[in-house]
Interface confidence: medium
């Protein structure tokens, strides 16, 4: 009687798990967002209004490239690759935009542009692609345009503060402004081995006449045309047996 | 009161399921049995006894490398790769030992190897390696051996049945007898493409005597000397999305 | 291929792959930039033994050791990845892959 | 790590993963070449809301729409292939990866 | 003339690196194993690992964080590199064509060479 | 790990007379006949005399042979000569890249 007795039990305990509630669609659509959250390591939503969006988004041709690829009227964006068979995401991309920073603030009275903070999770062996995007201001005329990427250094005895990262020397014709990209590769890998060494970088990009047309803090109607970093990582995700 | 009974209708119908037999180990065992068969487009295990696998077993050094990637006696053999989501198995290579052919024993009467089958599922652009293993015999003395792999061809006006795939010249030192690999990739894309174009090969390894040291058919205490084709292909399965 | 697909309109009691979106707009989830939608599909309905069976792992589970299991249930058996691009909410726009977001396909197990 | 792992002399009556091996040999199937054993696992015990939830897509279920389903299971959220060298029965020996043989991880879904 | 030939330092002092070469005549290496095996003075044979003839490496448990056998075919050698050696490690170290155990491997041998680990 | 226990360590015949010499593996070894003989003399590297368990090497006397199968082998001499004076090794292969030799018999001629 005693053994029938526990197989009552234990089948209750079973009925319990089988009649548990069928719950509605808003409860699915829950546990997807929550589960989302956990696979991106969110604790909660981003608390991001769609103006900061507006201002912050580059309209620029690698975040093009990215929404392009998505027809997001249609209703399956899945892509039908191998399932990973693990939990977390993997990032492939990562667009960084500046901050500020107390060092850069310091040089002369005024912020200067650009700082950009980096997570201590990117490893520098899995940076592929560094690319920094500047937006140049349309100009009046035909004229050539000098752009410098500079480094922000601790100060030497001599007083020099920077360091060239890279020059470049190009047309622009009068029409609409362009998106310019620098290979940043070799720095950003040397940041994040000695992240000590990230003071900063300062862009010019002077035409003919000394006028600087690199936006680096957005003026009014500017929105989304801040630099920013595009940095492209192979994410493989390490798969330790138990 | 109908809406009650309904879903104690429900409730039952999920009760049963819950409290369907909890299986034995030996039932767990069987399911992965059927599991398996599956997987491997199996109608049912293979009849081969244990004798038969020791003679036709290639003791050659694929089979060798093949085997050393497991740990055999170590429980858990899974190789922690990333899981492929999808239910059949995916071939990496397949060793074929040589059948009979109508055609190659007409030839004078008597059996000649050798004469391979092959699957219509192998797609001639997913062959990655082909190789013919052939085992020649030990020598007394120290030797020079011409090895020839000819193949078979409808007889022409001139009378040629064969015409020839590889030719090489090898130094033989007496010993054991050793395993030699020749490349036949073209020759089996070309019978994967053409299957009526496959009527069989004929080996020779002469040495300067005149004797074939190639092991045909394996005579006494020759098992696992057959010669065999060691084919590795890419089989990545095709993914569509419904 | 294994495993059934339904709609809302089936009568089909078996276990099946039925259709669910997820619009992140509607919910009000504009850091994720995009997609705006995507479907995300469940799995529902009975299974006998064996039908559809995809794992033997899970049901058949040693008589001596019963822990609760519930028998064969309809699950996901196959599942495929989404690209997202999103913000991050560190001043930082992510591009990447989210594992086991979408079902292709149910079965029992 | 997501999942608990067990073994026959645990109390845990939650979902778990618990050790299964299958040996080719000791039940002849010796036109398995190799591997001559594997561990295989299985996932049992009880299923509470969200405990070890992977996947929401299967018990979240339309309350419209019941159709059998039995709540959460306890099954496989995470398995691996095991590469097998094997006799086909036609002549040939195989080497080649077989899906989801093993089971890593088990969850409630 | 088939012929296997161990060379390498006779003297290693503790914790130093040991690199010796195996040169072999009258082998294609793309077609044949070649084994390390050891044998400590007085003692038994051991075998140490194994380059198979597409390259890959297998090693003794033993060895595995240490050991490090690779080839060049078109040199005709195989190299065996162990690091961290200890006095425990003084043997004579053999190689062999094909691998002890499996079909006929080991029915050839080099003469080995004594290394000796000593400060 | 793997032992490979030879027995006895040390054999002491007299010429013509029949040595057996055992091997006994603590796992099955690969296939159940991965395993191999091999005799060697002071200041020589060893030499070839049985592989797959029972098939005997080219150029080794037919006095000479192998059996067993899976954990247990023997090697037996069936008439003991002078130059089979020498220590005697088993080598047993496991699958998984795994190999192993036992510690070895000693073979004294009287």
């Known amino acids: 009687e005693n053994s029938e007795q526990k197989e009552n039990v234990e089948k209750e305990g079973l009925c319990n798990a089988c009649t548990w509630r069928q719950n509605t669609k808003s409860s699915r659509i829950e546990a997807i967002k929550i589960q989302i959250l956990s696979k991106l390591r969110l604790e909660t939503a981003p608390n991001i209004s769609k103006d900061a969006i507006r201002q912050l988004l580059p309209k620029a041709p690698p975040l093009r490239e990215l929404i392009d690829q998505y027809d997001v009227q249609r209703d399956d964006s899945s892509d039908g690759s191998l399932e990973d068979d693990d939990y977390h995401a993997t990032t492939e991309t990562i667009i960084t935009m500046p901050t500020e920073s107390d060092f850069l603030m310091q040089v002369d009275g005024k912020p200067k542009c650009c700082f950009f903070k980096f997570s201590s999770k990117i490893q520098y062996n899995k940076v592929v692609k560094a690319q920094l995007w500047i937006y140049l201001r349309p100009v009046e005329t035909p004229t050539t345009v000098f752009v410098q990427i500079l480094r922000l250094i601790k100060p030497m005895k001599d007083g020099t503060r920077y360091t060239g990262i890279r020059s470049l020397k190009l047309d622009m014709n009068p029409g609409t402004g362009i998106w310019q990209s620098i290979d940043v590769k070799t720095v950003l890998q040397n940041w994040l081995k000695q992240p000590e060494s990230n003071l900063g970088i300062e862009i010019k990009a002077l035409d003919e006449n000394g006028h600087d047309l690199a936006v680096t803090f957005p003026g009014p109607g500017e929105d989304g045309l801040n630099p920013f970093l595009e940095v492209k990582v192979t994410d493989t995700p390490k798969r330790s047996r138990r | 009161e109908n809406s009650e009974q309904k879903e104690n209708v429900e409730k039952e119908g999920l009760c049963n399921a819950c409290t369907w037999r909890q299986n034995t180990k030996s039932s767990r065992i069987e399911a992965i049995k059927i599991q398996i068969l599956s997987k491997l487009r199996l109608e049912t295990a293979p009849n081969i006894s244990k004798d038969a696998i020791r003679q036709l077993l290639p003791k050659a050094p694929p089979l060798r490398e093949l085997i050393d990637q497991y740990d055999v006696q170590r429980d858990d053999s899974s190789d922690g790769s990333l899981e492929d989501d999808d239910y059949h198995a995916t071939t990496e290579t397949i060793i074929t030992m040589p059948t009979e052919s109508d055609f190659l024993m007409q030839v004078d009467g008597k059996p000649k190897c050798c004469f391979f089958k092959f699957s219509s599922k192998i797609q001639y652009n997913k062959v990655v390696k082909a190789q013919l293993w052939i085992y020649l015999r030990p020598v007394e003395t120290p030797t020079t051996v011409f090895v020839q792999i000819l193949r078979l061809i409808k007889p022409m006006k001139d009378g040629t049945r064969y015409t020839g795939i590889r030719s090489l010249k090898l130094d033989m030192n007496p010993g054991t007898g050793i395993w030699q690999s020749i490349d036949v990739k073209t020759v089996l894309q070309n019978w994967l493409k053409q299957p009526e174009s496959n009527l069989g090969i004929e080996i020779k390894a002469l040495d300067e005597n005149g004797h074939d040291l190639a092991v045909t058919f394996p005579g006494p205490g020759e098992d696992g000397l057959n010669p065999f084709l060691e084919v590795k292909v890419t089989d990545t399965p095709k993914r569509s999305r419904r | 291929d294994f495993g059934l697909d339904c709609d809302e309109h089936s009568t089909e009691s078996r276990c099946c792959r039925y259709p669910l979106t997820v619009d992140f707009e509607a919910f009000g989830w504009d850091w994720i930039i995009a997609p705006k939608r995507y479907k995300a599909n469940y799995c529902s309905g009975e299974c006998e033994f064996v039908f559809l069976q995809k794992y033997p792992h899970t049901h058949l589970v040693h008589q001596a050791n019963p822990r609760g299991s519930a028998g064969p249930c309809c699950t996901p058996t196959k599942m495929s990845p989404i690209n997202m691009l999103y913000f991050n909410g560190k001043e930082q726009i992510i591009y990447g892959k989210i594992p086991a977001m979408v079902v292709d396909r149910c079965g029992c197990s | 790590d997501f999942g608990l792992d067990c073994d026959e002399h645990s109390t845990e009556s939650r979902c778990c993963r618990y050790p299964l091996t299958v040996d080719f040999e000791a039940f002849g199937w010796d036109w398995i070449i190799a591997p001559k054993r594997y561990k295989a696992n299985y996932c049992s015990g009880e299923c509470e809301f969200v405990f070890l939830q992977k996947y929401p897509h299967t018990h979240l279920v339309h309350q419209a729409n019941p159709r059998g389903s039995a709540g959460p299971c306890c099954t496989p959220t995470k398995m691996s292939p095991i590469n097998m060298l094997y006799f086909n029965g036609k002549e040939q020996i195989i080497y080649g990866k077989i899906p989801a043989m093993v089971v890593d991880r088990c969850g409630c879904s | 003339q088939v012929t296997l030939k161990e060379s390498g330092p006779v003297l290693v002092k503790p914790t130093e690196t040991l690199t010796l070469t195996c040169t072999v005549s009258?082998?294609?290496?793309?077609?044949?194993?070649i084994s390390w095996v050891r044998q400590a003075p007085g003692k038994g044979l051991e075998w140490v690992g194994i380059?198979?003839?597409?390259?890959?490496?297998y090693y003794a448990s033993w060895a595995k964080k240490r050991l490090t056998i690779s080839k060049d075919t078109s040199k005709n050698q195989v190299v065996l590199t162990m690091t961290n050696m200890d006095p425990v490690d003084t043997a004579t170290y053999y190689c062999?064509?094909?691998?002890?155990?499996?079909?006929?491997?080991?029915?050839?041998w080099g003469q080995g060479t004594l290394v000796t680990v000593s400060s | 790990d793997i032992v490979m226990t030879q027995s006895p360590a040390t054999l002491s015949l007299s010429p013509g007379e029949r040595a057996t010499l055992s091997c006994t593996s603590s796992?099955?070894?690969?296939?159940?006949?991965?395993l191999s003989w091999f005799q060697q003399k002071p200041g020589q590297p060893p030499k070839l005399l049985i592989y797959?368990?029972?098939t005997l090497a080219y150029g080794v006397p037919s006095r000479f042979s192998g059996s067993g199968s899976g954990t247990d082998f023997t090697l037996t001499i069936s008439s003991l000569q002078p130059e089979d004076a020498a220590t005697y090794y088993c080598?047993?292969?496991?699958?998984?890249?795994?190999?192993?030799f036992g510690q070895g018999t000693k073979v004294e001629i009287k």
């Open positions: 797959w368990a029972s």
């Open positions: 380059i198979s003839y597409a390259g890959k490496t």
């Open positions: 062999a064509r094909g691998v002890p155990a499996y079909s006929h491997g080991g029915d050839l």
């Open positions: 080598a047993g292969g496991y699958g998984g890249g795994r190999y192993a």
């Open positions: 796992q099955s070894v690969y296939h159940a006949n991965w």
């Open positions: 009258g082998i294609d290496l793309s077609h044949t194993d």
